[in-house]
């Protein structure tokens, strides 16, 4: 049903869903702090623009009695229950910030009027792609998929002279929410990744993964997995690995690789790490102290969600336009705004663009080094290290199929 919005007469409210089931196990207090810090900035920006208006956030908490798994498994109904709560209280703001689980966002989007924008820190899955009033501020699975296809096809770099068309994907079901949906997208038979590859098999057991490492009859030399170095070590240990195996470790929200004193452990030498360009430092923030890198990105997405709303509110108010319209709801895309940590660009579908970085372990220095970067906005790869000190033969990435010559 249509709910009246607290979104006019110089008073603009943001509805923030504080869900027990979340993409990252982050204390809600930290997210509240992030939102409040964002509000202070937005108020300053509006005041500076001569707009004498009030902007506030209402935090909507679920009771946590039924939906208490803490992860995203029971988030579908929790999201709808919170919407019902908003509806009953007639307390809808101009914008909804909050659902981070793919399940909850998908269901809430289906079951609600499209008259207000939704901003999500998460909602990584393909089922949340191409939603007209949904904005996602953490890299969704589609962006990862496009990088992988682009990289697989690349064959004109000094360190990658073969196109690849095959891959194993390791997915054992214990992944974090972001990894779950990234791997889910690679596994899906109808996805762009599957469509572009000639061979792809999902490895679901630790033993399957371990056996492939030295299997002479393997169908691909490339294995994609998602998680941090410790996750890989638990699985791989110090097992021998065939010299032409390449493990692609997707670890987007982790900037530990760029810290000065970090040395790559020996088991990372056959690994290329895909992460995001560093920068989510949040050095001066009250809410960011003692946060792990992943949680910092999550809190940052909440903060940037507030700044995005402020950016759009400012534009609409300066143009004398109404906020409670479909035009406003559909406007949160195809733009760049000043985020807390630098410029934030949203694509035509409201998904954040970023620079992904592919790292390798230098056999000389045992440090992580940047091999290439990838701009998700233009779907383009930029080589950085033209003479990498790889573990692989001739300092080149091997073919994806053993024994197959140049193509």
């Amino acid at each position: 049903s249509q709910v009246s919005q607290n979104c006019h007469n110089g008073s603009y409210e943001i509805s923030v869903l504080m869900m027990g089931n979340s993409a990252f196990a982050e204390p809600l207090k930290n997210l509240e702090d992030a939102v409040n810090e964002g509000l202070e900035i937005v108020r300053g920006r509006l005041q500076n623009a001569g707009l004498n208006v009030t902007v506030n956030a209402t935090f909507m908490y679920s009771d946590g009695l039924i939906h208490n798994s803490g992860d995203c498994r029971s988030s579908t109904c929790e999201g709808l229950d919170l919407l019902r709560k908003i509806s009953n209280a007639q307390r809808m703001g101009c914008v909804l910030i909050g659902p981070s689980c793919t399940y909850s966002t998908f269901q809430m989007y289906l079951d609600t009027e499209l008259s207000y924008p939704m901003i999500s820190a998460g909602s990584f899955g393909l089922s949340c792609d191409y939603k007209e009033t949904l904005t996602r501020l953490m890299s969704p699975a589609r962006k990862l998929m496009y990088f992988l296809v682009n990289f697989w096809k690349t064959n004109d770099l000094p360190f990658k002279t073969y196109s690849w068309s095959t891959s194993y994907v390791y997915k054992n079901g214990t992944e974090t929410e972001d990894c779950f949906w990234y791997l889910n997208a690679l596994e899906a038979s109808v996805s762009y990744f599957s469509h572009e590859l000639g061979f792809k098999v999902v490895l679901r057991q630790d033993k399957e993964f371990q056996d492939i490492l030295m299997d002479h009859n393997r169908k691909s030399n490339v294995i994609i997995m998602c998680g941090g170095p410790e996750f890989l070590y638990k699985l791989k240990g110090d097992r021998a690995v065939a010299e032409d195996i390449v493990i692609i470790l997707v670890d987007l929200f982790n900037d530990q690789y760029f810290e000065d004193n970090v040395t790559a452990p020996d088991y990372m030498k056959n690994v290329l790490v895909l992460t995001l360009s560093p920068g989510n430092s949040l050095l001066n923030s009250s809410f960011s102290r003692n946060l792990s890198p992943t949680k910092r990105d999550f809190a940052l997405a909440y903060l940037n969600g507030i700044l995005l709303f402020g950016h759009m509110l400012k534009i609409f108010l300066e143009n004398g336009e109404n906020i409670t319209t479909p035009k406003f709801a559909h406007a949160f895309r195809n733009l760049t705004f000043e985020g807390y940590d630098g410029p934030v660009t949203l694509d035509d579908w409201g998904d954040v663009d970023s620079t992904m970085v592919l790292l390798y372990t230098s056999v000389d220095t045992k440090k992580y080094k940047v091999l290439l970067t990838y701009d998700t906005h233009v779907n383009k790869t930029y080589p950085v290290d033209m003479s990498p000190t790889f573990t692989w033969k001739n300092s080149k990435l091997p073919n994806d199929i053993t024994g197959r010559g140049p193509q």
Epitope: N48, S281, Y340
Partner: nanobody, 119 residues
């Protein structure tokens, strides 16, 4: 009324150091990142360094490893610490703050402070 006031410029020998300051109105300082630009005689104004609200900084290649931008939230001030100065760093240095305009620079400028590197 938005105000940006730079200070700290002067004459210094090659290899020397200077610290520039830019004091800003609080409503601007707390709402946006801030930039330092410079303009050498007869040249275009160029960006030197940016500091975002988070404290993250970015630099032009010519000054990387020599210049450090920082912000003091208690004093609403941004600093540019310039070490190992070279003659080619000679320029008027400007502080730039506020929302980004259509021309991709920020809305407000300081009056500039002269830095001369010469023996």
């Amino acid at each position: 009324q938005v105000q940006l006031v730079e200070s700290g410029g002067g004459l210094v020998q090659p290899g020397g150091s200077l610290r520039l300051s830019c004091a800003a109105s609080s409503n601007i300082f707390r709402a946006y990142g801030m930039d330092w630009y410079r303009q050498a005689p007869g040249k275009q104004r160029e960006m030197v360094a940016t500091i975002w609200l988070s404290g993250r900084s970015t630099y032009t290649d010519a000054v990387k490893g020599r210049f450090t931008i920082s912000r003091d939230n208690a004093k609403n001030t941004v600093y540019l610490q310039m070490n190992n100065l070279k003659p080619e760093d000679t320029a008027v240095y400007y502080c730039n703050a506020g929302p980004t305009t259509a021309s991709s620079v920020r809305q407000y400028w300081g009056q500039g402070t002269q830095v001369t590197v010469s023996s």
